[in-house]
């Protein structure tokens, strides 16, 4: 039967996305139990039946992947999970509309920092994500992002820095003076969905200037 | 069986403010979201705004924004709509509706009149 | 916000003939994820609370008579009676669930002549 309040077994149901990996999460309210058992249903915007997701059905853990059924960006999905108690007390709670495209946070760029006598050079690799082609391939953020550029900062010294920016992979900060270490940092952004990943941040010393010695 | 019940309707002066009621039973209030429709003597349909019980998250038409508030209370299985400032052209039956696109379950209805 | 259109206004059916109310949107209601549009069909009867009759503009209903049945894309749809029971006079509504605020046509009365 129902509790008098749901939440006391269960609270916080949400998507948690990065990358485009979506990751159902939950807590327990104060009357959960760790031998609490929770199974978990999606659905799409404005389809009538919810389905259950095979691998989270009557499990003790408080997430649940649904990358793979959640892998349309375009769609708008839900998802709740039932709780039950080992008493037989039961509570449903469901997630608000969840857009991967407009939720997922991005997380730092996978970069190669290379130092140099007088400059640095620092290389994006591209971000691979879960979300497939039609043909099969895995996109990256670039191919899901048209308006993705980089953002990347070299801290000269406390007062100044030196920008670079751009849709590029291989960026290069020029003049600098050898052996002395800086701190890039390289941020992706997604002006229309109003992005900003956390900072890859990378400590680097330009090489010793041996044509002197 | 899904039943949602209404309540809380009635007389009210020009000025005031109502809060109605819709009762659940059958299902869980936090499975599905939950719409408020109303619906003027003799005419059509407009819809007031959502909530996802669940959440607490909301919806409203522009048109209702800062007059109109929803909420849940999870314990009781029941939906709540507040209106604030009514004035005559308020005069309705309001409905609660079930689920988050298109109803699949309404409520009976509950008469509000506004008047002096 | 997205305007929905009902045509006629009401008509009158002889019992046993085919009914047609047509609705129109003010922009399309094709979504774009599942190619369906987002359209729903309501009966109302007097005194009572509307019944969903129809959704994705062509689903019908769990225990809704397959005389109702509708049809359409974009911003033109249709819902039939395909055979006018005397149960079937009441006040019919579309309704669009592309884009907040969700909005409802104005009604058209069904009556038999």
């Known amino acids: 039967h129902a509790p008098e309040d749901p939440s006391d077994l269960l609270q916080h149901v949400k998507f948690q996305s990065s990358n485009f990996e979506n990751i159902l999460t939950w807590d327990s309210g104060p009357e959960g139990t760790p031998d609490t058992v929770y199974s978990i249903e999606y659905k799409t915007y404005g389809e009538r039946d919810w389905v259950a997701k095979k691998g989270c059905q009557r499990i003790t853990r408080k997430s649940c992947n649904l990358t793979v059924e959640t892998g349309n960006l375009t769609e708008l999905y839900y998802a709740r999970v039932t709780a039950v108690s080992a008493g037989g007390r039961s509570a449903t709670k469901m997630t608000d509309r969840f857009s991967s495209l407009q939720h997922t946070t991005l997380k730092p760029p996978d970069v190669t920092c290379i130092s140099k006598v007088r400059s640095i050079q620092m290389i994006v690799h591209p971000t691979p994500t879960p979300i497939r082609a039609g043909d099969g391939h895995r996109l990256t953020l670039e191919d899901i992002f048209h308006d993705l550029f980089y953002h990347l900062e070299l801290q000269v010294n406390r007062t100044y820095q030196m920008h670079l920016g751009g849709k590029q992979r291989e960026y290069e900060f020029f003049g600098l003076t050898p052996d002395t270490e800086f701190l890039g940092t390289i941020m992706i952004c997604v002006p229309t969905w109003a992005k900003e990943s956390a900072p890859y941040m990378c400590r680097v010393k330009t090489l010793p200037d041996r044509t002197w010695t | 069986e899904v039943q949602l019940v209404e309540s809380g309707g009635g007389l009210v002066q020009p000025g005031g403010s109502l809060r109605l009621s819709c009762a659940a039973s059958g299902y869980s209030l936090t499975a599905e979201y939950m719409n408020w429709v109303r619906q003027a003597p003799g005419k059509g349909l407009e819809w007031i705004g959502e909530i996802n019980p669940s959440t607490g998250t909301t919806t409203y038409n522009q048109k209702f924004k800062g007059r109109a508030t929803l909420s849940v209370d999870q314990s009781k299985n029941t939906a709540y709509l507040q209106m604030n400032s009514l004035r005559a052209e308020d005069t309705a039956v309001y409905y609660c509706a079930r689920f988050d696109a298109y109803f699949d379950y309404w409520g009976q209805g509950t008469l509000v009149t506004v008047s002096s | 916000d997205i305007v929905m259109t009902q045509s006629p206004d009401s008509l009158a059916v002889s019992l046993g003939e085919r009914a047609t109310i047509n609705c129109k949107s003010s922009q399309s209601l094709l979504y774009s994820s599942n190619q369906k549009n987002t359209l729903a069909w309501y009966q109302q009867k007097p005194g009572q609370p509307p019944k969903l009759l129809i959704y994705?503009?062509?689903s019908r209903e769990s225990g809704v008579p397959d005389r109702f049945s509708g049809s359409g894309s974009g911003t033109d749809f249709t819902l039939t009676i395909s055979s006018l029971q005397a149960e079937d006079v009441a006040v019919y509504y579309c309704q669009q669930y592309f884009s907040y605020p969700f909005t409802f046509g104005q009604g058209t009365k069904v009556e038999i002549k």
């Open positions: 994705w503009a062509s």
